[in-house]
Structures are given as structure tokens and as C-alpha cells.
């Protein structure tokens, strides 16, 4: 499988609320043998590989923000810690998840990366991620809602399998 | 604040088997690996195996296949760890980590020593 | 098997010194490399990950580097709490390998 970024950059106002997406792409197992555990945090372009580096979202590690379930289930992050940042990830019926941001700031710019990782008896994990940009602006140049930039066809499909 | 609590030292006739538990908190037991790491005195760290509790998945080092048995209780949030048909060769104090997927090991039990001795 | 190799079991520095310590491994691992400190009686702490990011709480004196098959640990100015052992491990494919370890000893 795959992880394809539908969009690699978002230019958001602040104040306003935005949600990042990727989507699972290709066969996906739905055994009952076959988790699929799914995350997201902030990083930086490495000077190796994008993604390498995990930092937290608005202090939410990338444990705190993961979903895992079964095949493409649907699914939602713990309600409670989450919602208390401003935060929701997502996932549904059609390998789509996301992560929902609200009123953001200056401070949430940045590398944002969602990671997709196959656990399967006696098999060693197979982990996919993808990357994006979030620009937060303020002032008059800052547009009145976000705009998305969708991907160019080699970056929609981040492949990073172990 | 996440933490992994380790069952006390055991002192082991060969032949005999051992169970040695491991008791998670602070965080979501069900969906970070349990690893399982070997460390023989004055030796390095050797990787047992581990288990994924929200399934029930298993991995091992080829080694411990017959040696080492996996388990995990998610109502308690405790791991554990079966040695059979111990030797001396078996006494070594026995590690267990956390490891969210697709990440290392990132958070350690204390140990547990076990000492195989007649 | 990936087999990671630390050439040196044993190496002698002096507190505020810059030491480094290598790992090899034996096939491409990325950038999948972790080291941990571990001190006399107790568990290993993982202090790099992905080859050089610190791991949070770990001091700044602490850094990583390498990618492929060669990785470098790096203390800038070693303090006396720091002389103990330290291990690589690589995490790009199961079964997760640990190098043989090095211990860092006063010169």
C-alpha cells in the first residue's frame, strides 16, 4: 500500500480551522491478522528523509494523535485530550484520514507528516508516510479562508516501507 | 507518565520454566509493541521478541522460537514473558520496552534478573 | 540478519573531551538508527533516534549523525556521568539488532 498527500501545502488565516488529509492507497489487507495503526506529527525536511523527526502538535506526541484499527474501519482519536488542543484526527471507510486543527496560529506552521503503519502476525511492519506544508499568515495578505495546493503527481505518493 | 513495572528477580532450578510479568501505565497499552530484550552479565542487549496487544501479533528472534513465550493481558495492561526448559545459559536479566509502531524503544522496565542455578 | 557493528568495546576519554563512538551496519538502514546510554545497574535510555534527533529530555552535548550503513554517536564535552556504555540499534527491519555496545572509560 501506499500514502498519497492529496494537497502539499495549505495557506490558512489564523483564526481559522483547517484539516490536513492523507489517504491509504492500494490493496489494503482486511484480515483479522492485519492492524493498521495511523499518526500524525509536526517535522522537518531532513537533509536525508522527510518525516525522520517527530515533534509534538500543539504538545500532542504522535501517541497522544494516533488511531489503529482493523482493514479501512473508521475511526477517532480519544475525544478528551485532543479536542482540549484544539485538535481531532480522523479516519474513514475509504482509506481517508486527517486531522482536524482549530483556530490556528502562527505557531502551528510548519512540516506536518501523517504515518500509516501495517502490523501483521509474524511479519515485520511495513510503514508509509506522508508530508505536508501548513503556512499560517496574518495581516492583509493573508487570505480570508485556507487555500490548498494539491500535489504534483510524484509528490502524492510518499513511499517509505520497512 | 509512562511507565513499565517489572515483576522482582527469580532464582530458577534447570529444567524448570519462568513467567515474569511487565505492567504498563500512562499510556494505551493496546496499541504500542512489548518488547523483550535479553542481557546476559557483561554481555549486550539481545532482542527476544514482541507483541502487539491490541491484536494478539507476534514477533521473534528466530534464537528464542521454543524458548520464549508471549502473552498479554489488556484488561490488566501487563505483558508477560514464559522461558522454558531453563538452563544456565538462560540467566541473564530480561528487559521489557515500549515501542509505539513504525518507532524505537522508547520507554524500559528495571529489569528482571533471573539466575538459573541447581 | 542486520548486524550492527560498534568497532570499539572499550574507549578512554577525559571529562570535556569530544568523543566519538561508530556503528556499522551490515546492509542500507536509512536513517533507522537509534543509540541509548546505559549505566551499571539499570535499563538502556534512548537518547538518539532516526541517526540525530535527540530524544526528548536528552541534553544538547548528546548528537547523532550517519545514514546507509555508517553512524556516528557524539558527546561534545563528556561529563563524569557519562562515562558508561552506549548502544546502537537499527530499526529498518525485524529482528530489531543492537551493536555490541561501547564503554566510555576516564583516560
Known amino acids: 500500500f501506499k500514502v498519497a498527500t492529496p494537497y502539499s501545502l495549505y495557506v490558512c488565516p489564523e483564526g481559522q480551522n483547517v484539516t490536513l488529509t492523507c489517504r491509504l492507497l492500494g490493496p489494503v489487507d482486511k484480515g483479522h491478522d492485519v492492524t493498521f495503526y495511523k499518526t500524525w506529527y509536526r517535522s522537518s525536511r531532513g537533509e536525508v528523509q522527510t518525516c525522520s523527526e517527530r515533534r509534538p502538535i500543539r504538545n500532542l506526541t504522535f501517541q497522544d494523535l494516533h488511531l489503529h484499527h482493523g482493514g479501512h474501519q473508521a475511526a477517532n482519536t480519544s475525544h478528551d485530550l485532543a479536542q482540549r488542543h484544539g485538535l481531532e484526527s480522523a479516519s474513514d471507510h475509504h482509506g481517508n484520514f486527517s486531522i482536524t486543527m482549530r483556530n490556528l496560529t502562527l505557531l502551528d506552521s510548519g512540516l506536518y507528516c501523517c504515518l500509516v503503519v501495517e502490523i501483521r502476525h509474524h511479519h515485520s511492519e511495513h510503514r508509509v508516510h506522508g508530508a505536508m506544508e501548513l503556512q499560517v499568515q496574518t495581516g492583509k495578505d493573508a487570505p480570508s479562508n485556507c487555500v490548498v495546493y494539491p500535489s504534483s503527481s510524484q509528490d502524492s505518493e510518499n513511499i517509505t516501507a520497512a | 507518565q509512562v511507565q513499565l513495572q517489572q515483576s522482582g528477580a527469580e532464582l530458577m532450578k534447570p529444567g524448570a520454566s519462568v513467567k515474569i510479568s511487565c505492567k504498563a501505565t500512562g499510556y494505551t497499552f493496546s496499541s504500542s509493541w512489548i518488547e523483550w530484550v535479553k542481557q546476559r552479565p557483561g554481555h549486550g542487549l539481545e532482542w527476544i521478541g514482541e507483541i502487539f496487544p491490541g491484536s494478539g501479533s507476534l514477533n521473534f528472534n528466530e534464537k528464542f522460537k521454543g524458548k520464549a513465550t508471549f502473552t498479554a493481558d489488556t484488561s490488566s495492561n501487563t505483558a508477560y514473558l514464559q522461558l522454558s526448559s531453563l538452563t544456565s545459559d538462560d540467566s541473564a536479566v530480561y528487559y521489557c520496552a515500549r515501542r509505539p509502531p513504525g518507532w524505537f524503544f522508547d520507554v524500559w522496565g528495571a529489569g528482571t534478573t533471573v539466575t538459573v542455578s541447581s | 540478519d542486520i548486524v550492527m557493528t560498534q568497532s570499539h568495546k572499550f574507549m578512554s576519554t577525559s571529562v570535556g573531551d569530544r568523543v566519538s563512538i561508530t556503528c556499522k551496519a551490515s546492509q542500507d538502514v536509512t536513517t533507522d538508527v537509534a543509540w541509548y546510554q546505559q549505566k551499571p545497574g539499570q535499563s538502556p535510555k534512548l537518547l538518539i533516534y532516526?541517526?540525530?534527533y535527540r530524544y526528548t529530555g536528552v541534553p544538547d552535548r548528546f548528537t547523532g549523525s550517519g545514514s546507509g550503513t555508517d553512524f556516528t554517536f557524539t558527546i561534545s564535552s563528556v561529563q563524569a556521568e557519562d562515562l558508561t556504555v552506549y548502544y546502537c540499534?537499527?530499526?529498518?527491519?525485524?529482528?530489531?539488532?543492537f551493536g555490541g555496545g561501547t564503554k566510555l572509560e576516564i583516560k
Open positions: 540499534q537499527q530499526h529498518y527491519s525485524s529482528p530489531w539488532t
Open positions: 532516526s541517526a540525530s
